[in-house]
Amino acid sequence: EEELQIIQPDKSVSVAAGESAILHCTITSLFPVGPIQWFRGAGPARVLIYNQRQGPFPRVTTVSETTKRENMDFSISISNITPADAGTYYCIKFRKGSPDTEFKSGAGTELSVRAKPS
Protein backbone atom coordinates (compact mmCIF):
# COMPACT_ATOMS: atom_id res chain seq x y z
CA GLU A 1 0.00 0.00 0.00
CA GLU A 2 1.35 3.41 -0.96
CA GLU A 3 1.63 6.07 1.71
CA LEU A 4 -1.49 8.20 1.85
CA GLN A 5 -1.22 11.74 0.53
CA ILE A 6 -3.97 14.33 0.88
CA ILE A 7 -4.00 16.77 -2.00
CA GLN A 8 -5.67 20.14 -1.64
CA PRO A 9 -4.57 21.71 -4.91
CA ASP A 10 -5.89 25.21 -4.27
CA LYS A 11 -3.99 27.35 -1.78
CA SER A 12 -6.79 29.88 -1.90
CA VAL A 13 -10.30 30.31 -3.29
CA SER A 14 -12.26 33.55 -3.56
CA VAL A 15 -16.05 33.49 -3.74
CA ALA A 16 -18.70 36.20 -3.84
CA ALA A 17 -21.14 36.28 -0.95
CA GLY A 18 -24.25 34.26 -1.73
CA GLU A 19 -22.43 31.98 -4.15
CA SER A 20 -21.15 28.43 -3.62
CA ALA A 21 -17.53 27.56 -2.86
CA ILE A 22 -15.91 24.38 -4.13
CA LEU A 23 -13.02 23.10 -2.02
CA HIS A 24 -11.02 20.36 -3.68
CA CYS A 25 -9.50 17.36 -1.90
CA THR A 26 -8.29 14.05 -3.24
CA ILE A 27 -6.53 11.22 -1.46
CA THR A 28 -4.04 8.81 -3.01
CA SER A 29 -4.93 5.70 -1.02
CA LEU A 30 -7.91 4.24 0.82
CA PHE A 31 -5.60 3.18 3.64
CA PRO A 32 -5.61 3.49 6.55
CA VAL A 33 -9.34 2.85 6.64
CA GLY A 34 -11.39 5.64 8.16
CA PRO A 35 -13.51 8.67 7.36
CA ILE A 36 -12.62 12.00 5.79
CA GLN A 37 -13.57 15.16 7.65
CA TRP A 38 -13.37 18.82 6.70
CA PHE A 39 -12.65 21.57 9.25
CA ARG A 40 -12.42 25.34 9.15
CA GLY A 41 -9.44 26.47 11.14
CA ALA A 42 -6.94 24.48 13.14
CA GLY A 43 -6.40 23.57 16.76
CA PRO A 44 -9.02 23.15 19.48
CA ALA A 45 -11.23 25.96 18.13
CA ARG A 46 -11.59 24.42 14.67
CA VAL A 47 -15.11 23.98 13.33
CA LEU A 48 -16.36 20.73 11.78
CA ILE A 49 -17.74 21.41 8.30
CA TYR A 50 -18.29 17.87 6.99
CA ASN A 51 -17.85 14.37 8.34
CA GLN A 52 -18.14 11.42 5.97
CA ARG A 53 -19.28 9.23 8.86
CA GLN A 54 -22.24 11.33 9.94
CA GLY A 55 -24.58 14.03 8.75
CA PRO A 56 -26.43 15.76 7.37
CA PHE A 57 -24.55 19.00 6.82
CA PRO A 58 -27.24 21.13 5.17
CA ARG A 59 -25.02 23.57 3.27
CA VAL A 60 -22.38 21.02 2.28
CA THR A 61 -22.52 18.53 -0.56
CA THR A 62 -19.81 16.29 -1.90
CA VAL A 63 -18.79 17.09 -5.45
CA SER A 64 -17.97 13.54 -6.50
CA GLU A 65 -19.88 10.30 -6.08
CA THR A 66 -18.72 9.20 -2.64
CA THR A 67 -20.83 6.02 -2.67
CA LYS A 68 -18.46 4.52 -5.26
CA ARG A 69 -16.40 1.93 -3.46
CA GLU A 70 -13.15 3.12 -5.04
CA ASN A 71 -13.85 6.85 -4.53
CA MET A 72 -10.86 9.00 -3.55
CA ASP A 73 -12.33 12.45 -4.27
CA PHE A 74 -13.66 14.23 -1.22
CA SER A 75 -14.11 17.70 -2.65
CA ILE A 76 -17.04 19.60 -1.17
CA SER A 77 -19.31 22.46 -2.18
CA ILE A 78 -20.53 24.92 0.44
CA SER A 79 -23.64 26.85 -0.57
CA ASN A 80 -24.75 30.40 0.20
CA ILE A 81 -21.37 31.66 1.31
CA THR A 82 -21.27 34.54 3.83
CA PRO A 83 -18.33 36.49 5.29
CA ALA A 84 -18.53 34.25 8.38
CA ASP A 85 -17.36 31.34 6.19
CA ALA A 86 -13.98 32.93 5.50
CA GLY A 87 -11.01 30.97 6.79
CA THR A 88 -8.69 28.10 6.02
CA TYR A 89 -10.31 24.75 5.31
CA TYR A 90 -8.52 21.47 5.96
CA CYS A 91 -9.34 18.07 4.49
CA ILE A 92 -8.31 15.49 7.09
CA LYS A 93 -8.12 11.70 6.96
CA PHE A 94 -8.99 9.86 10.17
CA ARG A 95 -7.96 6.34 11.09
CA LYS A 96 -10.90 4.24 12.26
CA GLY A 97 -11.16 3.47 15.96
CA SER A 98 -13.10 4.24 19.10
CA PRO A 99 -12.79 7.15 18.70
CA ASP A 100 -11.45 7.77 15.21
CA THR A 101 -8.03 9.42 15.36
CA GLU A 102 -6.58 12.06 13.06
CA PHE A 103 -4.08 10.54 10.64
CA LYS A 104 -3.11 13.15 8.08
CA SER A 105 -4.19 16.62 6.99
CA GLY A 106 -4.11 18.40 3.68
CA ALA A 107 -2.22 21.66 3.45
CA GLY A 108 -5.40 23.72 3.63
CA THR A 109 -7.34 26.02 1.31
CA GLU A 110 -7.96 29.62 2.32
CA LEU A 111 -11.46 30.80 1.48
CA SER A 112 -11.98 34.51 1.10
CA VAL A 113 -15.40 36.08 0.61
CA ARG A 114 -15.95 39.01 -1.72
CA ALA A 115 -18.80 41.44 -1.34
CA LYS A 116 -21.91 40.48 -3.27
CA PRO A 117 -21.88 42.35 -6.60
CA SER A 118 -24.46 45.13 -6.61
Epitope: F31, P32, R69, K96, S98
Partner: antibody, heavy 117, light 106 residues
Protein backbone atom coordinates in the same frame (compact mmCIF):
# COMPACT_ATOMS: atom_id res chain seq x y z
CA UNK B 1 -39.28 5.17 8.15
CA UNK B 2 -36.95 3.31 5.80
CA UNK B 3 -38.84 0.66 3.87
CA UNK B 4 -37.46 -1.88 1.39
CA UNK B 5 -39.90 -4.23 -0.31
CA UNK B 6 -38.63 -6.99 -2.59
CA UNK B 7 -40.68 -8.70 -5.27
CA UNK B 8 -40.25 -10.93 -8.30
CA UNK B 9 -39.34 -14.19 -6.59
CA UNK B 10 -40.90 -17.49 -7.51
CA UNK B 11 -40.27 -20.97 -8.84
CA UNK B 12 -38.20 -21.35 -12.01
CA UNK B 13 -36.48 -24.22 -13.80
CA UNK B 14 -32.71 -24.59 -14.04
CA UNK B 15 -31.28 -22.44 -16.82
CA UNK B 16 -34.12 -19.92 -16.68
CA UNK B 17 -33.93 -16.22 -15.74
CA UNK B 18 -35.64 -14.04 -13.18
CA UNK B 19 -35.62 -10.33 -12.35
CA UNK B 20 -36.03 -9.21 -8.75
CA UNK B 21 -37.13 -5.72 -7.74
CA UNK B 22 -36.77 -3.77 -4.51
CA UNK B 23 -38.98 -0.73 -3.97
CA UNK B 24 -37.43 1.78 -1.58
CA UNK B 25 -39.11 4.53 0.42
CA UNK B 26 -38.51 6.68 3.49
CA UNK B 27 -35.03 7.89 2.52
CA UNK B 28 -33.15 9.53 -0.33
CA UNK B 29 -32.75 6.45 -2.52
CA UNK B 30 -30.81 8.30 -5.23
CA UNK B 31 -28.11 9.25 -2.70
CA UNK B 32 -27.52 5.78 -1.26
CA UNK B 33 -25.57 2.75 -2.39
CA UNK B 34 -27.55 -0.50 -2.24
CA UNK B 35 -26.82 -4.23 -2.21
CA UNK B 36 -28.43 -7.63 -2.68
CA UNK B 37 -27.73 -10.34 -0.09
CA UNK B 38 -29.07 -13.89 -0.24
CA UNK B 39 -29.66 -16.73 2.20
CA UNK B 40 -29.97 -20.33 1.02
CA UNK B 41 -32.23 -22.64 3.07
CA UNK B 42 -30.52 -23.50 6.36
CA UNK B 43 -27.46 -21.42 5.46
CA UNK B 44 -26.00 -18.06 6.35
CA UNK B 45 -26.00 -14.68 4.62
CA UNK B 46 -24.11 -14.25 1.35
CA UNK B 47 -23.42 -10.92 -0.35
CA UNK B 48 -24.42 -10.97 -4.03
CA UNK B 49 -23.79 -7.52 -5.49
CA UNK B 50 -23.70 -3.82 -4.73
CA UNK B 51 -24.33 -0.63 -6.68
CA UNK B 52 -23.32 2.97 -6.06
CA UNK B 53 -25.82 5.81 -6.13
CA UNK B 54 -24.91 6.60 -9.73
CA UNK B 55 -24.80 3.00 -10.94
CA UNK B 56 -21.25 1.68 -10.55
CA UNK B 57 -21.54 -2.05 -9.87
CA UNK B 58 -19.68 -4.55 -7.71
CA UNK B 59 -20.14 -8.33 -7.55
CA UNK B 60 -19.23 -11.30 -5.46
CA UNK B 61 -16.81 -13.41 -7.47
CA UNK B 62 -19.14 -16.39 -7.70
CA UNK B 63 -22.01 -14.23 -8.96
CA UNK B 64 -20.14 -12.24 -11.61
CA UNK B 65 -21.30 -12.87 -15.15
CA UNK B 66 -24.71 -14.42 -14.42
CA UNK B 67 -26.18 -11.70 -12.21
CA UNK B 68 -26.63 -8.01 -13.02
CA UNK B 69 -27.50 -5.37 -10.43
CA UNK B 70 -29.09 -2.13 -11.62
CA UNK B 71 -31.24 0.71 -10.35
CA UNK B 72 -33.76 3.28 -11.52
CA UNK B 73 -33.46 6.34 -9.31
CA UNK B 74 -36.54 7.92 -10.87
CA UNK B 75 -38.57 4.95 -9.64
CA UNK B 76 -36.72 4.44 -6.33
CA UNK B 77 -36.20 0.83 -7.36
CA UNK B 78 -33.29 -1.59 -7.23
CA UNK B 79 -33.10 -4.63 -9.52
CA UNK B 80 -31.29 -7.95 -9.77
CA UNK B 81 -31.32 -9.75 -13.11
CA UNK B 82 -30.44 -13.41 -12.61
CA UNK B 83 -29.60 -15.62 -15.62
CA UNK B 84 -28.74 -19.31 -16.06
CA UNK B 85 -30.16 -20.14 -12.66
CA UNK B 86 -29.21 -23.36 -10.90
CA UNK B 87 -30.51 -25.16 -7.82
CA UNK B 88 -27.66 -23.55 -5.84
CA UNK B 89 -29.29 -20.14 -6.42
CA UNK B 90 -32.34 -21.19 -4.40
CA UNK B 91 -32.48 -18.67 -1.56
CA UNK B 92 -34.27 -15.75 0.01
CA UNK B 93 -32.94 -12.60 -1.66
CA UNK B 94 -32.78 -9.43 0.45
CA UNK B 95 -32.07 -5.90 -0.65
CA UNK B 96 -30.17 -3.78 1.85
CA UNK B 97 -29.24 -0.14 2.16
CA UNK B 98 -25.54 0.57 2.47
CA UNK B 99 -23.91 2.86 5.00
CA UNK B 100 -21.17 5.34 4.09
CA UNK B 101 -18.60 2.52 4.38
CA UNK B 102 -20.59 -0.14 2.51
CA UNK B 103 -21.98 -2.05 5.46
CA UNK B 104 -25.75 -2.51 5.78
CA UNK B 105 -28.15 -0.68 8.06
CA UNK B 106 -31.63 -1.54 6.74
CA UNK B 107 -32.95 -4.71 5.10
CA UNK B 108 -36.05 -5.72 3.20
CA UNK B 109 -38.24 -8.66 4.12
CA UNK B 110 -36.84 -10.74 1.28
CA UNK B 111 -38.26 -12.61 -1.70
CA UNK B 112 -37.89 -16.38 -2.14
CA UNK B 113 -36.37 -17.76 -5.33
CA UNK B 114 -36.70 -21.50 -5.88
CA UNK B 115 -34.87 -23.17 -8.76
CA UNK B 116 -36.21 -26.66 -9.32
CA UNK B 117 -36.92 -29.01 -12.20
CA UNK C 1 -13.71 -15.62 5.63
CA UNK C 2 -15.03 -14.34 8.94
CA UNK C 3 -15.14 -16.90 11.75
CA UNK C 4 -17.55 -16.83 14.68
CA UNK C 5 -18.68 -19.44 17.23
CA UNK C 6 -21.62 -21.61 16.22
CA UNK C 7 -23.46 -21.01 19.47
CA UNK C 8 -23.40 -19.20 22.80
CA UNK C 9 -25.82 -19.26 25.71
CA UNK C 10 -26.51 -17.04 28.68
CA UNK C 11 -28.97 -16.47 31.48
CA UNK C 12 -31.20 -13.40 31.41
CA UNK C 13 -29.37 -10.36 32.76
CA UNK C 14 -25.91 -11.69 31.96
CA UNK C 15 -23.44 -10.07 29.58
CA UNK C 16 -22.81 -11.93 26.32
CA UNK C 17 -19.81 -11.40 24.06
CA UNK C 18 -19.70 -12.82 20.53
CA UNK C 19 -16.41 -12.52 18.71
CA UNK C 20 -15.72 -12.65 15.01
CA UNK C 21 -12.23 -12.99 13.56
CA UNK C 22 -10.61 -13.27 10.18
CA UNK C 23 -10.81 -9.67 9.00
CA UNK C 24 -7.98 -7.17 8.85
CA UNK C 25 -7.16 -3.50 9.32
CA UNK C 26 -8.82 -2.86 5.96
CA UNK C 27 -12.22 -3.99 7.28
CA UNK C 28 -15.19 -2.27 8.81
CA UNK C 29 -17.58 -4.57 10.67
CA UNK C 30 -21.27 -4.86 11.40
CA UNK C 31 -23.61 -7.22 13.27
CA UNK C 32 -27.01 -8.43 12.10
CA UNK C 33 -29.72 -10.18 14.12
CA UNK C 34 -32.02 -12.76 12.55
CA UNK C 35 -34.75 -14.14 14.79
CA UNK C 36 -35.88 -16.95 12.48
CA UNK C 37 -34.52 -18.42 9.23
CA UNK C 38 -35.69 -16.47 6.22
CA UNK C 39 -36.93 -13.52 8.27
CA UNK C 40 -35.52 -10.06 7.63
CA UNK C 41 -32.16 -9.42 9.31
CA UNK C 42 -31.97 -6.43 11.62
CA UNK C 43 -28.72 -4.50 11.87
CA UNK C 44 -27.76 -3.99 15.51
CA UNK C 45 -24.25 -2.57 14.90
CA UNK C 46 -22.57 -1.00 11.87
CA UNK C 47 -19.25 0.79 11.36
CA UNK C 48 -17.67 -1.31 14.14
CA UNK C 49 -19.44 0.43 17.00
CA UNK C 50 -22.41 2.43 15.70
CA UNK C 51 -25.92 1.52 16.81
CA UNK C 52 -28.93 2.33 14.61
CA UNK C 53 -31.39 4.66 16.35
CA UNK C 54 -34.00 1.99 17.07
CA UNK C 55 -31.58 -0.53 18.62
CA UNK C 56 -31.45 -0.78 22.45
CA UNK C 57 -28.34 0.53 24.18
CA UNK C 58 -27.58 -2.93 25.62
CA UNK C 59 -26.08 -3.76 22.20
CA UNK C 60 -22.56 -2.48 21.62
CA UNK C 61 -19.73 -3.27 19.25
CA UNK C 62 -15.98 -2.92 19.15
CA UNK C 63 -13.22 -3.81 16.73
CA UNK C 64 -9.48 -4.24 16.85
CA UNK C 65 -7.57 -5.25 13.75
CA UNK C 66 -8.76 -8.65 12.60
CA UNK C 67 -11.43 -9.11 15.29
CA UNK C 68 -14.80 -7.56 16.09
CA UNK C 69 -16.93 -8.19 19.17
CA UNK C 70 -20.65 -7.81 19.78
CA UNK C 71 -21.54 -7.27 23.43
CA UNK C 72 -25.07 -7.60 24.81
CA UNK C 73 -25.17 -6.21 28.36
CA UNK C 74 -28.08 -7.57 30.36
CA UNK C 75 -29.30 -10.06 27.78
CA UNK C 76 -33.07 -10.54 27.50
CA UNK C 77 -35.20 -13.41 26.24
CA UNK C 78 -36.13 -11.45 23.11
CA UNK C 79 -32.44 -11.28 22.14
CA UNK C 80 -32.48 -14.98 21.31
CA UNK C 81 -31.54 -15.11 17.63
CA UNK C 82 -28.78 -15.89 15.16
CA UNK C 83 -26.19 -13.10 15.00
CA UNK C 84 -24.13 -12.65 11.86
CA UNK C 85 -20.97 -10.61 11.76
CA UNK C 86 -20.39 -8.86 8.47
CA UNK C 87 -17.44 -7.02 7.05
CA UNK C 88 -16.56 -4.70 4.22
CA UNK C 89 -13.03 -5.05 2.88
CA UNK C 90 -11.61 -1.85 1.37
CA UNK C 91 -8.83 -3.81 -0.30
CA UNK C 92 -11.20 -5.94 -2.42
CA UNK C 93 -14.38 -3.78 -2.47
CA UNK C 94 -16.35 -6.80 -1.27
CA UNK C 95 -18.66 -7.72 1.60
CA UNK C 96 -18.48 -10.94 3.57
CA UNK C 97 -20.34 -12.58 6.45
CA UNK C 98 -19.57 -15.03 9.19
CA UNK C 99 -21.58 -18.26 9.39
CA UNK C 100 -23.71 -16.99 12.27
CA UNK C 101 -23.83 -17.51 16.03
CA UNK C 102 -26.98 -18.88 17.66
CA UNK C 103 -27.64 -17.10 20.95
CA UNK C 104 -29.75 -19.10 23.39
CA UNK C 105 -31.16 -17.33 26.44
CA UNK C 106 -31.64 -19.96 29.12
Amino acid sequence: DVQLVESGGGVVRPGESLRLSCAASGFSFSSNAMSWVRQAPGKGLEWVAGISASGDTYYSGSMKGRFTISRDNSKNTLYLQMNSLTAEDTAVYYCARETWNHLFDYWGLGTLVTVSS
Amino acid sequence: ALTQPASVSANPGETVKITCSGGSDSYYYGWHQQKSPGSAPVTVIYSDDQRPPDIPSRFSGSASGSTTTLTITGVRAEDEAVYYCGGYDYSTYTNTFGAGTTLTVL
